[in-house]
């Protein structure tokens, strides 16, 4: 800031320092600094320093403060959705038998039509309409990797419910990968959670779009509410505008 | 606000409305409202309305905006830590054999000494020092429920690493439960993630405090770095102060 | 929290979220947004007194820090805390578009 | 983002995070906080121009909304965006205490 602003800057600094004095005392609920009359001489005990250091250290898996949104997130995102490939498609044939899993495949050409470039994607959600559920169920979501290998993505504990409910899984990273790769069909697997010592691995939850024996209108409604990817992305023309204005202010 | 302030309020409203005009156009990267000359007559297509409604609905599992911190979170939190009960304690005897899990038990009297009331606890983290790891490992954390039943809490994908690293799991809810109950010893289990179709369930990761055959100083250092609960809580005397000043401003 | 539950039902003179419904047609003269017809934008208004100086080290003032200047700013300001997005439907040529606009609805305010 | 990486290395005149190290002993005259000896508190400073009126509907101004008034406030204000906590060690009587103070360190600012 210019030199003429130095006095203002110093004044603001002084007011900020003054305010911090009040802030710290206030946060500690102290009317004035605590008496130091009982403090023993010498350094802090080792255990106290260890505790202080534990508190100070950011560690793996600890939720830090949320990151401020990047500049691109200020701009509007176009919303599209891509429905799951219908279950009578041949891709499902080799996966039909399982009692612990259901499979959801998506046509990547449809995804590319909605989002031409991976970098444009700002959020992708897998949405599933969960029908009523009698017992609590712990489910896991996997991404199809190579031929028959699956990569764990996330999990959810589903509470019993008498009414249908939409579930949402954040799959932004996965869809961004799919848009970068050449594959035609990509997919997810929803499985019962299996612990190492428990062998009860039946998927109890009923997801709309997988139940059989429906006819006519009901099947159509059912099909419309089948799993889908909700995509939020920067439109291509807006993105080009963004790239050209990368300079600061 | 008092009637004398009405004019100010109206002015602010007008400026806010004006600003929103610019904000919406800016977010859409439009210099002016779009031409409506090509818009077909009639209502919006069903599919578009469905998509609009999908976007508008908050659904289970979708990350909403972060909640603003409650008043109590403004105030300082006292930090304490409770080390895991050492592994030579008899409580571990019945759990020693497993290849897919390690067990961590805590003395609830120590927890209660640190946090006398469950409501005072604002955060509890289980911290584990992970030693070097040769392969990627997917681990799960469970809470001891009844005699031999375990409740799933969370999971973590651990990347290979040549250096030790502290891991942190948020276990606030669990510790709050423990503080409310009468139990003397409560515990966690860290297990290899087992998918329903894979049977490779060996826990590869080496957590400090569980390896055997150490002597003297090394064992002490090792013991000090054994798993612990890092607790952040409102001190009792500050909480009473908070309750008495529940009135607004 | 200085949210809609508290602020809309009180006569709070200090920083609070204030009601403001924007009707796209009436307020902005716009007919091009097809859905929604308007939305509760709301706004933040009210003073955030600067309440600390060296001669004010007493409990009454300190207890007010939480509301008036929790961030210990040199010039605290009443600003949005919790915000929500707004989806809209409009046409580009013959094509209807659904777009999500981030941070359009003010749910609560804070002194910052 | 108007964060320490950008602001500390630029001569930005508008809203930005500014460097401020608080030494508890020198700046506050306090000897009672045993750890840390001080901390980088930082602060937000700089104008957030109000850049919209009915006669300014053109691209140049609209592109600036992002920085100057993203929240479409009637009086945009330069305030903290990302904040971090500060743990401290002090004595209560003979007993050392570790306490965590939330939102003490300003990492980035925004016009709001």
């Amino acid at each position: 800031l210019s030199t003429s602003k130095t006095i203002d800057m110093e004044l603001v600094k002084r007011k900020r320092i003054e305010a911090i004095r009040g802030q710290i005392l206030s946060k500690l609920r102290l009317a004035s600094p605590p008496s130091q009359g009982e403090v023993p001489p010498g350094p802090l005990p080792e255990a106290v320093l260890a505790l202080y250091n534990s508190t100070r250290d950011r560690v793996a898996g600890e939720s830090a403060e949320p990151e401020p949104e990047p500049e691109a997130d200020y701009y509007a995102k176009e919303v599209t959705r891509v429905l799951m490939v219908e279950t009578h498609n041949e891709i499902y044939d080799k996966f039909k038998q399982s009692t612990h899993s259901i499979y959801m495949f998506f046509n990547t050409s449809e995804l590319r039509e909605a989002v031409p470039e991976p970098v444009l994607l700002s959020r992708a959600e897998l949405r599933l309409l969960r029908l009523k559920l009698k017992v609590e169920q712990h489910v896991e979501l996997y991404q199809k990797y190579s031929n028959n290998s699956w990569r764990y993505l996330s999990n959810r504990l589903l509470a019993p419910s008498d009414s249908p409910e939409w579930l949402s899984f954040d799959v932004t990273g996965v869809v961004r990968q799919w848009l970068s790769r050449g594959g035609e069909i990509e997919g997810f697997r929803l499985s019962a959670h299996c612990s190492c010592d428990s062998r009860d691995n039946t998927l109890q939850v009923d997801i709309n779009g997988f139940t059989t024996g429906r006819r006519g209108d009901l099947a159509t409604i059912h099909g419309m509410n089948r799993p889908f990817l909700l995509l939020m992305a920067t439109p291509l023309e807006r993105a080009q505008h963004l790239q050209s204005s990368r300079h600061r202010r | 606000l008092s009637t004398s302030k009405t004019i100010d309020m109206e002015l602010v409203k007008r400026k806010r409305i004006e600003a929103i005009r610019g904000q919406i156009l800016s977010k859409l990267r439009l210099a002016s409202p779009p031409s409506q000359g090509e818009v077909p007559p009639g209502p919006l297509p069903e599919a578009v309305l469905a998509l609009y409604n999908s976007t508008r609905d908050r659904v289970a599992g979708e990350s909403a905006e972060p909640e603003p911190e409650p008043e109590a979170d403004y105030y300082a939190k006292e930090v304490t830590r409770v080390l895991m009960v050492e592994t030579h304690n008899e409580i571990y005897d019945k759990f020693k054999q497993s290849t897919h899990s390690i067990y961590m038990f805590f003395n609830t009297s120590e927890l209660r000494e640190a946090v006398p009331e469950p409501v005072l606890l604002s955060r509890a983290e289980l911290r584990l020092l992970r030693l070097k790891l040769k392969v990627e490992q997917h681990v799960e954390l469970y809470q001891k429920y009844s005699n031999n039943s375990w409740r799933y809490l969370s999971n973590r994908l651990l990347a290979p690493s040549d250096s030790p690293e502290w891991l942190s799991f948020d276990v606030t809810g669990v510790v709050r439960q423990w503080l409310s109950r009468g139990g003397e010893i409560e515990g966690f289990r860290l297990s290899a993630h087992c998918s329903c179709d894979s049977r490779d369930n060996t826990l590869q990761v080496d957590i400090n405090g569980f390896t055997t055959g150490r002597r003297g100083d090394l064992a002490t250092i090792h013991g000090m770095n054994r798993p612990f609960l890092l607790l952040m809580a409102t001190p009792l005397e500050r909480a009473q102060h908070l309750q008495s000043s529940r009135h607004r401003r | 929290a200085l949210d809609t539950n508290y602020c809309f039902s009180s006569t709070e003179k200090n920083c609070c979220v204030r009601q403001l419904y924007i009707d796209f047609r009436k307020d902005l003269g716009w007919k091009w947004i097809h859905e929604p017809k308007g939305y509760h934008a709301n706004f933040c208004l009210g003073p955030c007194p600067y309440i600390w100086s060296l001669d004010t080290q007493y409990s009454k003032v300190l207890a007010l820090y939480n509301q008036h200047n929790p961030g210990a700013s040199a010039a605290p300001c009443c600003v949005p805390q919790a915000l929500e997005p707004l989806p809209i439907v409009y046409y580009v040529g013959r094509k209807p578009k659904v777009e999500q606009l981030s941070n359009m609805i003010v749910r609560s305010c804070k002194c910052s | 983002a108007l964060d320490t990486n950008y602001c500390f290395s630029s001569t930005e005149k508008n809203c930005c995070v500014r460097q401020l190290y608080i030494d508890f002993r020198k700046d506050l005259g306090w000897k009672w906080i045993h750890e840390p000896k001080g901390y980088h508190a930082n602060f937000c400073l700089g104008p957030c121009p109000y850049i919209w009126s009915l006669d300014t509907q053109y691209s140049k101004v609209l592109a600036l909304y992002n920085q100057h008034n993203p929240g479409a406030s009637a009086a945009p204000c330069c305030v903290p965006q990302a904040l971090e906590p500060l743990p401290i060690v002090y004595y209560v009587g003979r007993k050392p205490k570790v306490e965590q103070l939330s939102n003490m360190i300003v990492r980035s600012c925004k016009c709001s």
Epitope: S35, Q36, G37, E38, V39, P40, P41, G42, P43 | - | - | R25, K31, W32, H34, Y91, R94
Partner: antibody, heavy 119, light 107 residues
Framework: EVQLLESGGGLVQPGGSLRLSCAAS????????MTWVRQAPGKGLEWVSA????????YFADSVKGRFTISRDNSKNTLYLQMNSLRAEDTAVYYC????????????WGQGTLVTVSS | DIQLTQSPSSLSASVGDRVTITCRAS??????LNWYQQKPGKAPKLLIY???NLQSGVPSRFSGSGSGTDFTLTISSLQPEDFATYYC?????????FGGGTKVEIK
């Protein structure tokens, strides 16, 4: 204004006793630990004893342990040093000082009182 | 007990000179070191606390540095009123101990 005023010094025979006082003013006495430091003629400073604000904790140099006791009366804003079994090497100017903080620096000192142990 | 060794025990300097006094501890004392100034017939006066912090009211020509076992008191430009004896003191552990002192005399 912080003031510390020592009294009670004088001539005493070896083996005798003496009680030094330090009257404090200008600050909240009970909030501060207090200390005694002595200086033999022509020599350097030697720390003698200290006491916490409440009087609950006391500290002594090895050279006076078991012979000297430190105490305080917070209602009278006064610090004491009871010296028994005095020796010739205890001859010195005795200063009382205020312990400023948990770092144990002595920020205010009295003018001192002379204790002479001689037969 | 922790021993503090001051050097030099005395020095002669002129007004305007830069003067450096060192204090060495027999074991590490972190930054638990204070510096005092004493003039003949007067009580000591605190100059520097916690190795490097200037006590309120003390001229800025005085500065302290160091950590662990080696510490320094520096007077950047000696003034007439600075001719005195200077003591270091450790507060790392009881018994608290002082250095032997450094007498700064007029050359």
């Amino acid at each position: 204004e912080v003031q510390l005023l020592e009294s009670g010094g004088g001539l005493v025979q070896p083996g005798g006793s003496l009680r030094l006082s330090c009257a404090a003013s200008g600050f909240t006495f009970a909030d501060y630990a207090m200390t005694w430091v002595r200086q033999a003629p022509g020599k350097g400073l030697e720390w003698v004893s200290a006491i916490s604000g409440s009087g609950a904790a006391t500290y002594f140099a090895d050279s006076v342990k078991g012979r000297f006791t430190i105490s305080r009366d917070n209602s009278k804003n006064t610090l004491y040093l009871q010296m028994n079994s005095l020796r010739a090497e205890d001859t010195a100017v005795y200063y009382c000082a205020r312990v400023s903080s948990g770092h144990w620096d002595f920020d205010y000192w009295g003018q001192g009182t002379l204790v002479t142990v001689s037969s | 007990d922790i021993q503090l060794t001051q050097s030099p025990s005395s020095l002669s300097a002129s007004v305007g000179d830069r003067v450096t006094i060192t204090c060495r501890a027999s074991q590490s004392i972190s930054s638990y070191l204070n510096w005092y100034q004493q003039k003949p017939g007067k009580a000591p006066k605190l100059l520097i606390y916690a190795a490097s912090n200037l006590q309120s009211g003390v001229p800025s020509r005085f500065s302290g540095s160091g950590s662990g076992t080696d510490f320094t008191l520096t007077i950047s430009s000696l003034q007439p009123e600075d001719f005195a004896t200077y003591y270091c003191q450790q507060t790392y552990t009881v018994p608290l101990t002082f250095g032997g002192g450094t007498k700064v005399e007029i050359k």
